[in-house]
């Protein structure tokens, strides 16, 4: 349940984090799972524990195995397992699947490739980046902090990207490499006739007289950035601004969200101190874009 796979190459540094949550003040004990033998905390050892972290400086193939970490928190001890595999260095350029971190996707607008696991290490910029084992050169590639940015991404930028950096521990330097695949996706947006998610058409909302209530108008308009997409409330067919009732206010600005890639917009109508006359009004949620206008009506009724 609380097990995490970690891998590295022989003669490189590998740092593994305990897969259980900890706090800086809580001791973490590390053990070789097979022997139950405690892992030392002294930094003179090649393999040593340092709080939440288990450090192999450098790693050897024989280090492969399962390691147990126990977070000594009050109330309950939290136990986790790190499944570590150390591989021999590959003679050729090919990086096998078992050494690959998760694939990332990019597009013309967003082409960041983060160097996997780098946050665990004590490294200094710059990172070195390679694509299919070739060092990346040219102004299109920018190594920025812990990620690579590619300008004007094209489909042939897809491939395996390796980051290489130096981990420093007490003045000693250790090399680390990590590889992940990068795929390029076509970010084609589209626009469609608005779909109102809330309220349902001809919905009735129960309210209590004297209480405050909020009505949310939420609609989706397509995928990606939209040229025109607006939602608003009307009262009896009139704009809120034309309806001189200070108790009833439409939220300033519109909250834009991307739900499952869809461009959706919300606006909230706030009614303070609900009065009997508010029950007689017709509240229209309007969603408008270049394809047209959709309207859903909601009325208020007194809570029994």
């Amino acid at each position: 349940k609380f097990s995490k796979q970690s891998w590295g190459l022989e003669n490189e540094a590998l740092i593994v984090r305990c897969p259980r949550q900890g706090k800086s003040s809580y001791i973490v004990d590390w053990y070789y799972s097979q022997t139950n033998k405690s892992i030392p905390t002294q930094e003179r050892n090649r393999v040593f524990a340092s709080g939440q972290l288990l450090k192999f400086l450098p790693a050897e193939v024989a280090d492969s195995g399962i390691y147990t970490c126990i977070v000594r928190s009050p109330t309950f001890n939290r136990t986790g397992y790190a499944n570590v595999t150390i591989y021999k260095k590959q003679p050729d350029c090919n990086v096998p699947d078992y050494l690959m971190y998760s694939t990332v996707s990019g597009s013309e607008k967003n082409s960041k490739i983060y160097c996997p696991t780098i946050d665990l290490y004590n490294w200094t910029a710059p990172l070195e980046w390679f694509k299919n084992c070739q060092a990346l050169q040219g102004s299109r590639y920018k190594a920025h902090k812990s990620f690579l940015v590619i300008d004007n991404v094209m489909t042939d930028d897809a491939g395996d990207y390796t980051c290489k950096f130096i981990h420093n521990e007490n003045g000693a330097n250790y090399s680390v490499t990590a590889t992940r695949s990068f795929t390029v996706k076509d970010e084609q947006g589209f626009s469609r006739f608005p779909v109102i998610r809330a309220p349902a058409h001809n919905e009735t909302k129960e309210v209590e007289i004297g209480e405050n209530t909020n009505l949310t108008c939420s609609a989706c308009f397509g995928k990606g950035a939209q040229f025109l997409a607006t939602v608003q409330w009307q009262l009896n067919g009139n704009k809120i601004t034309d309806f001189s009732e200070p108790r009833i206010q439409q939220e300033e600005g519109q909250n834009q969200s991307f739900s499952n890639g869809l461009a959706c917009v919300n606006t909230v109508l706030r009614i303070a101190d609900v009065k009997e006359e508010d029950l007689l009004l017709r509240y229209d949620c309007l969603a408008l874009n270049l394809h047209g206008l959709r309207r859903h009506t909601i009325r208020l009724s007194r809570k029994n």
């Epitope: 349940k1 609380f2 259980r20 949550q21 706090k23 800086s24 003040s25 809580y26 001791i27 000594r72 928190s73 009050p74 109330t75 309950f76 939290r78």
Partner: antibody, heavy 123, light 111 residues
Framework: EVQLVESGGGLVQPGGSLRLSCAAS????????MHWVRQATGKGLEWVSS???????YYSGSVKGRFTISRENARNSLYLQMNSLRAGDTAVYYC?????????????????WGQGTTVTVSS | NIVMTQTPLSLSVTPGQPASISCKSS???????????LFWYLQKPGQPPQLLIY???NRFSGVPDRFSGSGSGTDFTLKISRVEAEDVGVYYC????????FGPGTKVEIK
């Protein structure tokens, strides 16, 4: 306002089942360990079960194998499924908040308690 | 299991007078993080327990300063400098070093 509201208590026959719920509001539920504590009429407080932020579960010896604690972070809810109930399980069951794992220094014990829900096991 | 004991089990106090409750644990409540996991609660009639003191001596927010906690290791004390009518109820000590255990409670009433 930080609040815990228990529900689901009632009268049940020995051997029966009941599911208690606790609705949390006013805080980031997912970052806290959560617990159930019970109190029989006129008696002291007894810890029953706990669930940590990562879903690991813990039980007192008297309920182990019969009770199951669970949480649904998306609904800000804590549950206690009680099976094979006995007369000795009759008590007020309190839902209570424990350690906050998003705050490195935070540990106020069981700092927030619900009003409790009454479970009566009787034939 | 850590066992908690409290003395006295009941206490009758004159308003304005001090009161003291003792709590002992079967083993030290000092954790490797340097903190001691001992708490005091007050349960007023018909209400859930409310936290008074955490970490032996820290007053929880909103708790009047007439309440104070002290102690270390296995021996702890809750003191009320001047008892008020609203202080009646049952006082529990609790440890959370290993799971949770409560003391049997001390019933405080006004003379």
């Amino acid at each position: 306002e930080v609040q815990l509201v228990e529900s689901g208590g009632g009268l049940v026959q020995p051997g029966g089942s009941l599911r208690l719920s606790c609705a949390a509001s006013g805080f980031t539920f997912s970052t806290f360990d959560m617990h159930w504590v019970r109190q029989a009429t006129g008696k002291g407080l007894e810890w029953v079960s706990s669930i940590d932020t990562e879903g690991d579960t813990y039980y007192s010896g008297s309920v182990k194998g019969r009770f199951t604690i669970s949480r649904e972070n998306a609904r800000n809810s804590l549950y206690l499924q009680m099976n094979s109930l006995r007369a000795g399980d009759t008590a007020v069951y309190y839902c209570t908040r424990g350690e906050d794992w998003s705050d490195d220094d935070y540990y106020y014990g069981l700092d927030v308690w619900g009003q409790g829900t009454t479970v009566t096991v009787s034939s | 299991n850590i066992v908690m004991t409290q003395t006295p089990l009941s206490l009758s106090v004159t308003p304005g007078q001090p009161a003291s409750i003792s709590c002992k644990s079967s083993q030290s409540l000092l954790h490797s993080d340097g903190k001691t996991y001992l708490f005091w609660y007050l349960q007023k009639p018909g209400q859930p327990p409310q936290l008074l003191i955490y970490g032996v001596s820290n007053r929880f927010s909103g708790v009047p300063d007439r309440f104070s906690g002290s102690g270390s290791g296995t021996d702890f004390t809750l003191k009320i400098s001047r008892v008020e009518a609203e202080d009646v109820g049952v006082y529990y000590c609790m440890q959370s070093l290993q799971l949770f255990t409560f003391g049997p409670g001390t019933k405080v009433e006004i003379k």
